[in-house]
């Protein structure tokens, strides 16, 4: 039950996170005009990854797409790439995790396969979340650098005679959405990885039982090998001899070793 809950919760958290990453990537407010000494402005500028917008106090808003690829800063291109990679990995992770959900039965899919898929989707969510967090952080760093540069050059002109107020940009809503969404995706991924450990079919720890063979007495102690990776059965370490005698408390159905509340 705990494994199902952990897996389900991990899926839902990741789903919310990836939806947030998509929303953040599409949002126009990655950077917004800094209203340092003027809380009410007649012309408000804000920029996204794909276009820049101007909102006037008249209510009119005009957005212009960045219709160039080569003319854009390399950092912006890098942020775009990170966000897209995050979305793609997250989307694939979601697809994989749907089939991996314990509550969903698909044909005669083995639990080991579900464990594999859960771990795969978990890793994908972790990488997706990291990509989003990295993308947003790179953009934030770029903003901070530009902010202090424009503060230093607040008034430019010949000998400071001509007053040309430079527009400073600060963190937009999309950055916070991106950070939170990336974090959620990361948490969801970790939860999926934790759930995977419980889903993995584990070898039962048998008690040592003595079997009397003809000739001399040999005590077989089938080792309680525990699948540490969470991936399927390991034939290398698999018990070759399965003793017939078991005590009652050892009879379990897979994968219920950790399936309790």
């Amino acid at each position: 039950m705990a494994v199902t809950a952990c897996q389900g919760l991990g899926f839902v958290v990741s789903l919310i996170g990836i939806a947030g990453i998509i929303a953040a990537t599409c949002m126009d407010q990655w950077s917004t005009q800094d209203l340092y000494n003027n809380p009410v402005t007649a012309v408000f500028n804000y920029q996204g990854l794909w276009r820049s917008c101007v909102r006037e106090s008249s209510g009119f808003t005009e957005c212009r797409g960045y219709f160039t690829l080569l003319g854009l800063p390399a950092m912006l291109q890098a942020v775009r790439a990170l966000m897209i990679v995050g979305i793609v990995l997250g989307a694939i992770g979601l697809l994989v995790s749907i089939f991996a959900l314990k509550c969903i039965r698909i044909g005669s899919m083995e639990d080991s396969a579900k464990a594999n898929m859960t771990l795969t989707s978990g890793i994908m969510f972790i990488v997706s979340g990291l990509c989003a967090i990295a993308g947003v952080s790179v953009f934030a760093n770029m903003l901070v650098t530009n902010f202090w540069m424009s503060t230093a050059n607040m008034y430019t002109g010949m000998g400071g005679m001509v007053q040309t107020v430079q527009t400073r940009y600060t963190f937009g809503a999309a950055l916070f959405v991106g950070w939170v969404a990336g974090g959620l995706t990361l948490i969801g991924g970790v939860m999926m990885c934790i759930a995977c450990r419980g889903l993995a079919p584990e070898e039962t720890n048998y008690k040592a039982v003595s079997y009397h063979a003809s000739g001399h007495s040999v005590a077989y102690k089938p080792g309680g090998f525990k699948a540490s990776t969470g991936f399927g059965s390991n034939t290398k370490n698999k018990k070759i001899y399965d003793g017939g005698a078991r005590t009652e408390d050892e009879v379990q159905s897979y994968p219920s070793k950790h399936d309790y509340v």
């Epitope: 917008c53 009119f60 007053q163």
Partner: antibody
Framework: EVQLVESGGGLVQPGGSLRLSCAVS?????MNWVRQAPGKGLEWVAW????????TYADDFKGRFTISRDDSKNTLYLQMNSLRAEDTAVYYC???????????WGQGTLVTVSS | DIQMTQSPSSLSASVGDRVTITCKSS????????????LTWYQQKPGKAPKLLIY???TLESGVPSRFSGSGSGTDYTLTISSLQPEDFATYYC?????????FGQGTKVEIK
């Protein structure tokens, strides 16, 4: 078609108060009050976002004048307190449009501050 | 606050003349976000409310005759009437539409010569 009709102007004593109204019909996102003293130029008084009610004022009118709106009546107001002789002017309400220009204006209402 | 200075304060011209009015702002009205200058021009006739002629320094308001044109960027702007008509005799105002408080120029009165 946008229509703006001002009312509430008149004669008031110095230190007195007056409330101007501007009946609005048609789409307006944000509105302004602009005044013009006799024989003088245009002077912007205040702006309001008709949806949020967020206002802003010219420095000379902060604390004395209050711009507001009543959604149910579709009316814009300018509450003027502590009036002075120099506040004598024709007061216009005007709609803000693209480029922050004022495309629709009321006919104006005259406010005379005199003892 | 941004100060707006218009020149001349008045001018006399004949019908058919080309008239140029200039407006200077104490700060740039050019918005970096959309590369548009937030300067507006109005025409006002005695006893009437002002009429919007041009916004964004050079965009003609719908219904305004094409003989009116606006130009300029940064701090220097111009309103040009290519061929003055009898109905164009009025007072013209420029307005800072870039930042609050909105400020107007003192006006330029165009009179018949």
């Amino acid at each position: 078609e946008v229509q703006l009709v001002e009312s509430g102007g008149g004669l008031v004593q110095p230190g007195g108060s007056l409330r101007l109204s501007c009946a609005v019909s048609g789409y307006t996102f944000s509105m302004n009050w602009v005044r013009q003293a006799p024989g003088k130029g245009l002077e912007w008084v205040a702006w309001i976002n008709m949806y949020t009610g967020e206002p802003t004022y010219a420095d000379d009118f902060k604390g004395r004048f209050t711009i507001s709106r009543d959604d149910s009546k579709n009316t814009l107001y300018l509450q003027m307190n502590s009036l002075r002789a120099e506040d004598t002017a024709v007061y216009y309400c005007a709609r803000l449009t693209k480029g922050n220009g004022m495309d629709y204006w009321g006919q104006g209402t005259l406010v005379t501050v005199s003892s | 606050d941004i100060q707006m200075t218009q020149s001349p304060s008045s001018l006399s011209a004949s019908v058919g003349d080309r008239v140029t009015i200039t407006c200077k702002s104490s700060q740039s009205l050019l918005n970096s976000g959309n590369q548009k200058s937030y300067l507006t021009w109005y025409q006002q006739k005695p006893g009437k409310a002002p009429k919007l002629l041009i916004y964004w320094a050079s965009t003609l308001e719908s219904g305004v005759p094409s003989r009116f044109s606006g130009s300029g960027s940064g701090t220097d702007y111009t309103l040009t009437i290519s061929s003055l008509q009898p109905e164009d005799f009025a007072t013209y105002y420029c307005q800072n539409a870039y930042s609050f408080p909105f400020t107007f120029g003192q006006g330029t009165k165009v009179e018949i010569k």
